[in-house]
């Protein structure tokens, strides 16, 4: 009886089970009762990453430098090229098809997490006792200066954007 289902890494065609082509190879011709499935290796800059019956290999992804992209991992006959972004840029999507400049955290905000090739800068508001007076993609919120430890007193209170201003203590006559 002709099969109705096939084993893993096989496919059903013309009432018989044929072997799938292994990753890195494409289908040239289906098997017969006399011959195995005929497969051919993918060409340069092509790949197939699964057991398959594809008649054409996929083209490796192109990491376009005009879009801020560079190669993170070169593709093989079994894997696609992995792109990432140039320094100071990050991917706009999981597929990393283009890049944008890392955002900077405005004054009053500090960097919670520095950007990577795939994620943007994460900013957080400076809490009480901390400040940031610059727009930066790297600077965290800094703690206000402790006037007391310098034997000084606060002359001007700090904000989320400015440090405290310390001054000498008034001497009692």
């Amino acid at each position: 009886e002709p099969p109705t289902a096939c084993r893993e890494k096989q496919y059903l065609i013309n009432s018989q089970c044929c072997s799938l082509c292994q990753p890195g190879q494409k289908l040239v011709s289906d098997c017969t009762e006399f011959t195995e499935t005929e497969c051919l290796p993918c060409g340069e800059s092509e790949f197939l990453d699964t057991w398959n019956r594809e008649t054409h290999c996929h083209q490796h992804k192109y990491c376009d430098p005009n879009l801020g992209l560079r190669v993170q991992q070169k593709g093989t006959s079994e894997t696609d090229t992995i792109c990432t972004c140039e320094e100071g840029w990050h991917c706009t999507s999981e597929a990393c098809e283009s890049c944008v400049l890392h955002r900077s955290c405005s004054p009053g905000f500090g960097v919670k997490q520095i950007a990577t090739g795939v994620s943007d800068t994460i900013c957080e508001p400076c809490p009480v006792g901390f400040f940031s007076n610059v727009s930066s993609a790297f600077e965290k919120c800094h703690p206000w200066t402790s006037c007391e430890t310098k034997d000084l007193v606060v002359q001007q209170a700090g904000t989320n954007k400015t440090d405290v201003v310390c001054g000498p203590q008034d001497r009692l006559r």
Epitope: V28, S29, C31, T32, E33, F34, T35, E36, E38
Partner: antibody, heavy 117, light 107 residues
Framework: EVQLVESGGGLVKPGGSLRLSCAAS????????ISWVRQAPGKGLEWVAS????????YYPDNVKGRFTISRDNAKNSLYLQMNSLRAEDTAVYYC??????????WGQGTLVTVSS | EIVLTQSPATLSLSPGERATLSCRAS??????LHWYQQKPGQAPRLLIY???QSISGIPARFSGSGSGTDFTLTISSLEPEDFAVYYC?????????FGGGTKVEIK
Amino acid sequence: EVQLVESGGGLVKPGGSLRLSCAASGFTFSNYGISWVRQAPGKGLEWVASISSGGDNTYYPDNVKGRFTISRDNAKNSLYLQMNSLRAEDTAVYYCARAGEKAMDYWGQGTLVTVSS
Amino acid sequence: EIVLTQSPATLSLSPGERATLSCRASQTINNNLHWYQQKPGQAPRLLIYYASQSISGIPARFSGSGSGTDFTLTISSLEPEDFAVYYCQQFSSWPLTFGGGTKVEIK
């Protein structure tokens, strides 16, 4: 017991025709592809033709394509090879062989075809 | 067409010796290769299929190995009845092709 018995061989003049038969028994003939393989005197094995179990697909090497025709009658458990425009180089023992697991797992004893003037 | 080259053409050995027969394909054929034995005046007999799979009823002294382009048939200890011609056959693509054969003869 699986058995394949060839017949129809003989002496034929160049340009002539011959029809070989292969009678099968001991297995469900209609479930198997069958091939013809030949062997010239003192030489190696050479594939000649194959036919799928249902008879809908046939395969030939270039040197016999257009001259030889493989066919089968599943109701009669029989395989045939019609050979036309025969040449001296077609002289050989012709075997029919069953295809099991894509291998020629059972063979007949062969029939001799001699093409000579 | 895939060309199969068998070597040596003739192998002269004594009973009890180990026989190593080679079959080389002109292009990669994965494990899509069979081995046959033929004795004088007889039809060929299937010995090994898919390069290394043993056949029921074939003595365990016959074994096959290899994949890609290089294949080997080994007879671990020759018996008198093993002196014959051995053929490899590829079924990776059309046309089906056989090697030229290796004759194993008594030394």
